[in-house]
């Protein structure tokens, strides 16, 4: 039985789409393409003549057709006009004549996605961000992705507006990245360049290292003190020192040379996030001891949290 | 008291290269990263970039990447910048300069400057 | 990059006068703000940073305000010694930028 095949079945406009005729009559002796379901004379694109190879336009011929001497039927450039049925009739020798209807559908191309946000920099645990996927293209479906990944399944995360718009609520640190949309339809896609959310953050309770393990580890006079704080934040925080309440250097690292019992007291760091208004601090009490005996570095370290 | 000491001024022909000194005192060199600025007579200011001196991390501004070579000397609290392929758009004060802090601080010692002329 | 825009390039005033200074981000440095006095000939010198802490030993006539995008550098009742030229810098990561500065002269 004749039939008729799309290749592709679903037509990206602009590009081309191949009628193809599968079993073939053996006593054909010429071939006629119309569009739509039936043949009539004024739907005609082209006939052939397989003994001359002759074709032959015809009313509905648009000048983008051409017929193959295997009934293949190939249409370039389509428009969305193009969409829809396609007849062949097989002349047979007996003229008794075969015809077969195939069709295909032609998509818009689609545009480059572009992805506009209400905030690229938002502070973790306060603001959402909106991301919208623009232009809006009808029936045409709306994917994102995050640093190459398809979405994850989260709470936090909203799609709405037929996926148009991906809300984050309540940005977490983790939600930092790389962000594209992608606009498909049966025919095509096409990805948005990414676009950076920089999560600002922290800073977190800071930690002054060397940790001293165990609580009596000794600071005995003459030694150097050296201190280092750390705390995670975005964008790095300002660090400041303190002794016994009294402003130190603003330094990651606090350095004493050769302490002495003058040394006993507390000793915080401060940190500081001016993108996210928030500051932390850790206060640890440092014991130094004359040569012999072994008190250290208090085990009862107390941090403080601002907002 | 902290101070930054740079070295005299240099007179250079176009297309060589000169390397300046900026030696650090009254504070301890590897805790405080140092800057470079270059101001062009009657201009504003314009940054080069940073050394980290304990670490060696550099991080230039695009225009110098290709210009400037920062390092520094943790012996002899000295950090040098050298200037290559030099032009006449290359004649300015060069200045060093202390990073108040660590991260998002300030330049808050700054150095004399050095005067480079070139000539062709 | 970050540009930073100060307006006005020059200003002319008398000692005992208020002047302003203004600063703007091209985009949202929160507080990352710094000011700096130069004067003839010599090396630039810390004002204010975090847009409004006074550094020490800086005469309390000087302040800095805002936020985001907008700041000012306030000096008010001028004395002879504050002539010269001022420039802002923001130093919110790098690359540190500073504005065009404003040349304050003696009316």
């Known amino acids: 039985k004749l039939t008729i095949e799309s290749t592709p079945f679903n037509v990206a406009e602009g590009k081309e789409v191949l009628l193809l005729a599968h079993n073939l009559p053996q006593n054909r002796i010429g071939y006629s393409w119309y569009k739509g379901e039936r043949v009539d004379g004024n739907s005609l694109i082209v006939g052939y003549v397989i003994g001359t190879q002759q074709a032959t336009p015809g009313p509905a011929y648009s000048g983008r057709e051409t017929i193959y001497p295997n009934a293949s039927l190939l249409i370039q450039n389509v428009t969305q006009n193009d969409t829809g049925f396609y007849t062949l009739q097989v002349i047979k020798s007996d003229l008794v004549n075969e015809e077969a209807t195939g069709q295909f559908h032609v998509y818009p191309e689609l545009p480059k996605p572009s992805i506009s946000s209400n905030n690229s920099n938002p502070v973790e645990d306060k603001d959402a961000v909106a991301f919208t996927c623009e232009p809006e293209v009808q029936n045409t479906t709306y994917l994102w992705w995050v640093n190459g990944q398809s979405l994850p399944v989260s709470p936090r995360l909203q799609l709405s507006n037929g996926n148009m718009t991906l809300t984050l609520l309540s940005v977490k640190r983790n939600d930092a990245g790389s962000y594209e949309c992608e606009i498909q339809n049966p025919a095509s896609a096409n990805r948005s360049d990414p676009v950076t959310l920089n999560v600002l953050y922290g800073p977190d309770v800071p930690t002054i290292s060397p940790i001293i393990s165990p609580p009596d580890s000794s600071y005995l006079s003459g030694a150097n003190l050296n201190l280092s704080c750390h705390s995670a934040s975005n964008p790095s925080p300002q660090y400041s020192w303190r002794i016994n309440g009294i402003p130190q250097q603003h330094t990651q690292v606090l350095f004493i040379a050769k302490i002495t019992p003058n040394n006993n007291g507390t000793y915080a760091c401060f940190v500081s996030n001016l993108a996210t208004g928030r500051n932390n601090s850790i206060v640890k009490s440092i014991t130094v001891s004359a040569s012999g005996t072994s008190p250290g570095l208090s085990a009862g370290a107390h941090h403080h949290h601002h907002h | 008291q902290v101070q930054l000491q740079q070295s005299g001024a240099e007179l250079a022909k176009s297309g060589a290269s000169v390397k300046m000194s900026c030696k650090a005192s009254?504070?301890?060199?590897?805790?405080?990263?140092l800057h470079w600025v270059k101001q062009r007579p009657g201009q504003g200011l314009e940054w080069i970039g940073y050394?980290?001196?304990?670490?060696?991390?550099?991080n230039y501004s695009q225009k110098f990447k290709d210009k400037a070579t920062l390092t520094a000397d943790k012996s002899s609290s000295t950090a040098y910048m050298q200037l290559s392929s030099l032009t006449s758009e290359d004649s300015a004060v060069y200045y060093c300069?202390?990073?108040?802090?660590?991260?998002?601080?300030?330049?808050?010692?700054w150095g004399q400057g050095t005067s480079v002329t070139v000539s062709s | 990059d970050i540009q930073m825009t100060q307006s006005p390039a020059s200003l002319s005033a008398s000692v005992g006068e208020t002047v302003t200074i203004t600063c703007r981000a091209s985009?949202?440095?929160?507080?990352?703000l710094a000011w700096y006095q130069q004067k003839q000939g010599k090396s630039p010198q810390l004002l204010v940073f975090?847009?409004?802490n006074l550094v020490e030993g800086v005469p309390s006539r000087f302040s800095g305000s805002g936020s985001g995008t907008q700041f000012s550098l306030k000096i008010n009742s001028l004395q002879p010694e504050d002539f010269g030229s001022y420039y802002c810098?923001?130093?919110?990561?790098?690359?540190?930028?500073f504005g065009g500065g404003t040349k304050l002269e003696i009316k």
């Open positions: 300069a202390r990073e108040y802090g660590n991260y998002n601080y300030p330049l808050d010692y």
């Open positions: 009254g504070y301890i060199f590897t805790s405080y990263w």
């Open positions: 810098q923001h130093h919110y990561g790098t690359p540190y930028t």
């Open positions: 985009e949202n440095i929160y507080g990352y």
């Open positions: 975090n847009a409004k």
């Open positions: 050394i980290n001196p304990n670490t060696g991390y550099t």
